[in-house]
């Protein structure tokens, strides 16, 4: 039997190709030369080596670069990249948009792990901010992603690259995510005219204050319930039943649906009755009439 | 949803050839190996080899070699698979299947299996 | 080759009982094993990959379990349409192959 360390007669690659499927794992690690499959790692991804087959694979480019890959070979990892792991991610330098986009179609189709994670914070981190053109790439894989960076790190993203952002991109954002993509929407859209830009800023509209949603109530956007549900409770409660009137337009009459669910609820709390019947939708749980609404959170902020 | 749908039986003598055909749709043709395995009547699963179709580049397991030929034609989403030289042992169900994952070769989706009769 | 050795040949377990397959693999396959079953006249459909991960859709009373040269299947409460030949697969290297199968019948 020949000794695993020494590579039998005649089975040293010259190239890699597809006759390397057949070599066991001892073979290619006695086989196969590192340099060689550095140069040539663009065939790799072309050839379906098993996943113990890239464990040695690995180990040969783990040896070959010690201090991290070149990006000319991360390029063309391809399944390579499923398993590597954060740390070794960590050492690498991604400046491209190109091997980003190659590394992230390996994953398509799967969650956000660990090592995709990691490259995207590399590659960020690299650009010094999240561009337009980033932003587009990593919406398109993984839509979600958007809302699973911190407040602290969506401020680091420009205006500009709201463009990029689908409503479903913001699905899964928080109140504190909204609050700090609201302000960038609103200068990004700044320059459209009212129904385009309420089309725009929808989606964002979680983070929305009061005065810009009195603000919008003055244009006749009509906002579907499903919108208004997701506006900021602390937002919603200073605005009138008749500015709630003009915001939601014909989708007033959801209200009834919605009375016992936040904000509507909160909000109906606060309205006086007499305003809340003018509605015609039997909303109950208004301020009876004659009762007076005294502010005590204002009457605070004065002393 | 995934379909791979075969031609239908053959009957061959022996030494003569016969060419089975795979036709692919809902998915991209081009994106996945398509490989070709045979059952022999009341055996196990033989995996006979692969072709990608977007680089027509192919393996065949060793015991075929010389005798298998597998191809595509791209613009009907149609993989097919040629054995010559037939053999009464050569009797057996062939079936198309492809692998989602290359660097986990199991068998995503299969073909409904083409039976080939060798006999005199 | 690495050669997938299954036993037994064929099983006879009552409806709702339990159901136990083993296949054992000629090398240290790791992890790299996948379980289809064939029903009479069918191509084989995918149970289980990774020796343990259920495939989309199929029923958790199948179950895979084992690693390095010995895996095993088992179905927790055999039920009627669960009546099959089933076989196992090694993907840790190519050629890749079989097991000769087990045909599993209603006692």
């Known amino acids: 039997e020949v000794e695993k360390t020494a590579c039998p007669s005649g089975k040293k690659a010259r190239e890699i190709d597809e006759s390397l499927i057949f070599y066991k794992k001892w073979e290619l690690e006695a086989c196969v030369d590192a340099a060689l499959l550095a140069t040539q790692m663009d065939r790799v991804n072309a050839i379906p080596f098993t996943y113990e087959q890239l464990d040695v694979l690995k180990h040969k480019l783990d040896e070959l670069y010690p201090q991290g890959y070149p990006e000319s070979v991360i390029q063309h990892l391809g399944y390579l990249f499923l398993k590597m792991s954060p740390e070794d991610i960590r050492k690498w330098n991604v400046t491209s948009l190109e091997t980003l986009k190659a590394l992230l179609e390996v994953n398509k189709g799967h969650e956000m792990s660990p090592q995709v994670a990691t490259l995207i914070d590399r590659f960020v981190k690299g650009r010094g901010q999240l561009d337009k053109d980033t932003l587009d790439t990593l919406t398109a894989f993984y839509p979600g992603y958007l809302c699973s960076l911190s407040p602290e790190e969506l401020s680091s993203v420009p205006p500009s690259s709201i463009w990029a952002v689908r409503p479903q991109d913001l699905d899964t954002c928080d109140p504190r995510q909204l609050d700090v993509l609201y302000p960038k929407a609103r200068l990004a859209f700044q320059n459209m005219n009212g129904s385009e830009y309420f089309v725009k800023i929808q989606s964002f509209l979680g983070g929305a204050p009061t005065e810009d949603l009195k603000a919008l109530s003055q244009q006749n956007v009509s906002m579907d319930l499903a919108t208004f549900m997701k506006l900021r409770t602390d937002a919603v409660l200073p605005l009138t039943v008749a500015e709630v009137q003009k915001l939601l337009g014909p989708h007033v009459e959801g209200l009834k649906a919605e009375e016992r669910h936040r904000p509507v609820r909160d909000w109906i709390l606060r309205q006086r009755q007499d305003d809340l019947d003018t509605l015609g939708l039997g909303l109950q749980g208004g301020i009876p009439n004659g009762y007076l609404v005294l502010d005590l959170s204002m009457q605070e902020a004065l002393s | 949803q995934v379909q791979l749908v075969q031609s239908g039986a053959e009957v061959k003598k022996p030494g003569a050839s016969v060419k089975v055909s795979c036709k692919a749709s809902g998915y991209t043709f081009t994106s996945y190996w398509m490989h070709w395995v045979r059952q022999a009547p009341g055996q196990g699963l033989e995996w006979m080899g692969w072709i990608h179709p977007n680089s027509d580049n192919t393996i065949y397991y060793e015991k075929f070699q010389g005798r298998v030929t597998m191809t595509v034609d791209k613009s009907i989403s149609t993989a097919y698979m040629e054995l010559s030289r037939l053999r009464s042992d050569d009797t057996a169900v062939y079936y198309c299947?492809?692998?989602?994952?290359?660097?986990?070769?199991?068998?995503?989706?299969w073909g409904q299996g083409t039976l080939v009769t060798v006999s005199s | 080759d690495i050669v997938m050795t299954q036993s037994p040949d064929s099983l006879a377990v009552s409806l709702g009982e339990r159901a136990t397959i083993n296949c054992k693999a000629s090398?240290?396959?790791?992890?790299?094993v996948a379980w289809y079953q064939q029903k009479p006249g069918q191509s084989p459909k995918l149970l289980i990959y990774w020796a343990s991960t259920r495939h989309t859709g199929v029923p958790d009373r199948f179950t895979g379990s084992g690693s390095g040269t010995d895996f095993t299947l088992t179905i927790s409460s055999l039920q009627a349409e669960d009546v099959a030949v089933y076989f196992c697969?090694?993907?840790?290297?190519?050629?890749?192959?079989f097991g000769a199968g087990t045909k599993l019948e209603i006692k």
């Open positions: 299947a492809i692998i989602i994952t290359p660097v986990v070769p199991k068998f995503d989706y």
């Open positions: 697969q090694q993907y840790s290297s190519y050629p890749l192959t």
């Open positions: 090398h240290d396959v790791g992890t790299s």
